[in-house]
Amino acid sequence: LVPHLGDREKRDSVCPQGKYIHPQNNSICCTKCHKGTYLYNDCPGPGQDTDCRECESGSFTASENHLRHCLSCSKCRKEMGQVEISSCTVDRDTVCGCRKNQYRHYWSENLFQCFNCSLCLNGTVHLSCQEKQNTVCTCHAGFFLRENECVSCSNCKKSLECTKLCLPQIENVKGTEDSGTT
């Protein structure tokens, strides 16, 4: 018969912070490995040292752990315009970012592309460019915002969403077209 584990035994089998349960013996709590190292061998018994080894070049662990392998260092995505802000060390992953006057656009949770901050030509800066957000522009009269650039209302077609902003110009263009066909 397998004895039923009481509340006290359950509590005892949960290790304190900084330790983990030995995978083969849940009565033993082993000390976790420091960041920059990984688990080579579990501790042989209570109060005995865990065998931790330093991560090899090109790999890291950023927090205390009991991982059997270090994590591979990230590579900055050159095709996304990313640059290396700081290189990978045994206890910290590569930090990638963008150049000056660029911002990050996140395509997915872990993938960003660097784009140039809009200069707001034919408009004014409403909000400055930030690390993860493009400049927010307000366009001058006779211009409308398209993909964060101020475009002349002469490029506003009726089907586009610029018609309200460019209504007087649209009417003028329509009038010119009508007078040209009579």
């Epitope: 656009h105 996140y106 997915s108 398209r146 993909e147 969403e161």
Partner: nanobody, 116 residues
Amino acid sequence: EVQLLESGGGLVQPGGSLRLSCAASGFTFGDDWMTWVRQAPGKGLEWVSGIAAYGISTYYADSVKGRFTISRDNSKNTLYLQMNSLRAEDAAVYYCAESGKVFDYWGQGTLVTVSS
């Protein structure tokens, strides 16, 4: 409430084509950049393609460049992905999402199977 509903997946032979659609609601679709991501069995999410708000600028992962085309119809609140010259490695569940945002909203995805 944000809703994204992908469709158009199916079984296709290598070299074949499929057109995926993503019907969006609950947010101002026309103002948002959109993206397609995929997840092959047992693998992580992979970014496929993205498109700016008005569809002028489009972006592709190197693995699909020249074969896939992303487009959108803002009047229908719909995002598309035309996939040509499909390969075995394109087999995955495809999801659409708002890009540049917190990625909290996902549809159920649409499964693309590439097999002879």
